[in-house]
């Protein structure tokens, strides 16, 4: 068992200036890297997984594109990308790394996601072995990063496959580490050079400061000046800072991403894998031909690196490279109450009692093909029917007789007759009235609008009913 | 069960539009892409383009100055207009929903033969 | 555009026997994304396969897909009266899709 860390250590244009992005971002951003682990040397395609696992950074300060005058570098997250494996480090692997861009704008569905850079290294490495730098192109990005595998304890050796225990009964004790190199024997870490920089240096033997790539002076404190040497491929030197050519072309193979070197009078020629060209293999634009976008979608245009690829996403994702999923069901697209399923392939929606169709939207109880029975008319609305049935007639269809003197509608004690025009209330003596609500004065004027002409108190009031609703 | 009806003239003259239209019932058409496939008369089948609700379209470039695919959310249709044509735009028309995994086709109208001849 | 190369051009077999289509990619299709269809004479294409290998909803388990990169392979496990037909592969990785040229099983 193991860590396998990733140092970012700066991402922006490469020397041949600014590049020309597919994205154009229309707020703040922010950086994030995923790293993928990959054993064996060979092409895997593009989707098969990160057999060795793979990790996601923290984001990174946010920043403001400004597209006149691109930023010479990002802003990045802090910390290194760790990803732990469990099993044998296989010692050839192949590392992706790809840079992420968010945008923070007010898109729907949250915040976009596109992929800038995606950059491939096919290498050796042992584990417990020093950091590794290195300096990739993709397109016209330029990625600086080391890396390095270590063992976890007690596992050690190069592909962290052999367990050592002290050789003493006791455990070892605090600050220290169990078996030296060669001996089952505790031992202490090394301590580094004082003031060695705990961010771009470290040490594998007590005292010194060695520094990972992009950072010089005896504490690791210095930036490296970008400005003579980094296209130069070759071992490292902490002294400079810079990278120095070996005394053959081929010398610490200057061919990157798993090119082979070839030796030709007074130079080199790399043979690069597919997807990688340039002079030494260090150019790997994304395009179509890799495959971004995820989730089915087809990508479009893109046919070379430096034209811009889109993709165009099934409805059920969003973002550049279709990695986002959409809640479809957040759109509410069922209608009249149904319940929303997202099926991933397909919308599903299960409708409530009485609606039908795809997206519930057929009111099984409407008026179409529905008569309201002796001459009550159908009313839509509210997701149901109902009819306004004619005086006399009730029930959800106006089948049912209805007593309009059912509800007991003449006042102070007068008496109710059900009439073929409506219902007729005789007033009890005192009350007028078509509900017999108006009580009648002793000189015989009505305290409230007067009575009809020729109506005596207590004769039969006639109110027509005109209709009666029935609620379903 | 949802179902595409393509509509539209079977007999076309040269240099002229062929216009075609494809219903689609028992499903709304803001839920997915939308294409149209032709196959000439003992051939394979050659894709044409498609569109989504929101206005996206893609074509396929051997056809693209001549064509243009529409769609009409009132009435659940869309369709398709090429013009300038030949006698090399005979073909069976299909129309056809993408599926929502991915570019593929999983649902196709019956076809309708469009010649073009004077 | 990425080309589509079928094989055989016509398979000829008998009800029961086991079917084996080819469909060769001019260049690697990405995330597997490859589809299978059947046509029968006077009918529209019906989608069998999506995704190189996963079956379209009710098609029997006898239809199976398979490859990556360039190579895929459709295989019909036992021939029913009814496979017999057109089949195409179509790729929708990169635009413009295209389609394979077909391969007819046909009755021996």
């Known amino acids: 068992a193991g860590v396998f860390e990733l140092q970012i250590h700066s991402f922006g244009p490469g020397p041949g200036g600014a590049p020309r992005s597919p994205y154009s971002a229309r707020g703040p951003c922010r950086l994030f890297f995923r790293v993928c682990l990959k054993p064996g040397l060979s092409e895997e395609a593009a989707e098969s997984p990160c057999a060795l696992g793979a990790a996601l950074s923290a984001r990174g300060p946010v920043y403001t594109e400004q597209p006149e005058a691109p930023a010479p570098d990002l802003p990045l997250p802090n910390g290194l990308l760790q990803v732990p494996f469990r099993d044998a480090w296989p010692g050839t692997f192949s590392l992706i790394i790809e840079t992420w861009r968010e945008e923070l704008g007010d898109q729907i569905g949250g915040p976009a996601w596109s992929l800038l850079a995606r950059v491939t290294r096919r290498r050796r490495l042992a584990a417990g072995g020093p950091w590794a730098g290195d300096i990739q192109r993709a397109g016209a990005w330029e990625l600086r990063f080391s890396y390095r595998a270590r063992c976890e304890l007690p596992a050690v050796g190069t592909a962290c496959t052999r367990l050592c225990r002290p050789r003493s009964a006791s455990r070892c004790g605090p600050g220290l580490r169990p078996c030296a190199p060669l001996e089952d024997e505790c031992e202490a870490p090394p301590v580094c050079r004082a003031g060695c920089s705990l961010e771009h240096g470290f040490c594998e033997q007590p005292g010194e400061c060695r520094c990972l790539e992009g950072w010089t002076g005896p504490l690791c404190m210095v930036p490296v000046s970008t400005s003579s040497c980094l296209g130069l491929r070759g071992p490292s030197s902490t002294t400079t800072g810079c990278l120095v050519p070996g005394p053959g072309p081929c010398d610490g193979n200057p061919c990157a991403n798993g090119g082979s070197c070839s030796e030709t009078p007074g130079s080199f020629e790399c043979t690069c894998p597919r997807g990688f060209y340039g002079l030494r293999c260090e150019v790997s634009g994304v395009t179509c031909a890799d495959g971004p976008c995820f989730n089915g979608g087809l990508c479009v245009g893109g046919a070379d690196p430096d034209s811009a690829y889109i993709c165009h996403c099934p409805p059920g994702f969003q973002g550049s490279n279709c990695e986002k999923r959409v809640d479809r069901c957040s759109l509410q697209p069922c209608r009249n109450g149904g319940l929303c399923l997202d099926l991933g392939h397909a919308l599903r929606c299960r409708c409530r009692a009485g609606f039908a169709g795809p997206r519930c939207e057929h009111d099984l109880n409407d008026c179409a093909g529905r008569a309201c029975a002796n001459g009550g008319t159908c009313v839509e609305g509210g997701g149901a029917h109902r009819c306004s049935c004619a005086l006399g007639f009730g029930g959800r269809d106006c089948r049912e007789r209805a007593d309009p003197c059912a509800a007991r509608p003449c006042a102070h004690g007068g008496r109710c007759y059900a009439h073929f025009s409506g219902l007729v209330c005789a007033c009890a003596p005192g009350y007028m009235g078509a509900r017999c609500e108006f009580p009648v004065h002793p000189d015989g004027v009505s305290a409230l609008p007067a009575a009809p002409p020729g109506l005596r108190p207590g004769d039969p009031q006639r109110y027509p009913h005109h209709h009666h609703h029935h609620h379903h | 069960q949802v179902q595409l009806q393509e509509s539209g003239p079977g007999l076309v003259k040269p240099s002229e539009t062929l216009s075609l239209t494809c219903t689609v019932s028992?499903?709304?058409?803001?839920?997915?892409?939308w294409s149209w496939i032709r196959q000439p008369p003992g051939k394979g089948l050659e894709w044409i383009g498609y569109i989504f609700y929101s206005g996206t379209t893609n074509h396929n470039p051997s056809l693209k100055s001549r064509l243009t695919i529409s769609l009409d959310k009132a009435k659940n249709q869309f369709s398709l207009r090429l013009s300038s044509v030949t006698a090399a735009d005979t073909a069976v028309y299909y129309c056809?929903?993408?599926?929502?995994?991915?570019?593929?086709?999983?649902?196709w109208g019956q076809g309708t033969m469009v010649t073009v001849s004077s | 555009e990425i080309v589509l190369t079928q094989s055989p051009g016509t398979l000829s077999l008998s009800p029961g026997e086991r079917a084996t289509l080819s469909c060769r990619a001019s260049?690697?299709?990405?995330?597997?994304?490859l589809a299978w269809y059947q046509q029968k004479p006077g009918q529209a294409p019906r989608l069998l396969i999506y995704g190189a290998s996963s079956r379209a909803t009710g098609i029997p388990d006898r239809f199976t897909g398979s490859g990556s990169g360039t190579d895929f392979t459709l295989t019909i496990s036992r021939l029913e009266p009814e496979d017999f037909a057109v089949y195409y592969c179509q790729q929708y990785g990169t635009s413009p899709l295209t389609f394979g040229g077909g391969t007819k099983v046909e009755i021996n």
């Open positions: 260049q690697r299709i990405s995330r597997t994304y």
């Open positions: 028992d499903d709304s058409i803001s839920n997915y892409y």
């Open positions: 056809a929903r993408v599926f929502n995994w991915g570019f593929a086709f999983d649902i």
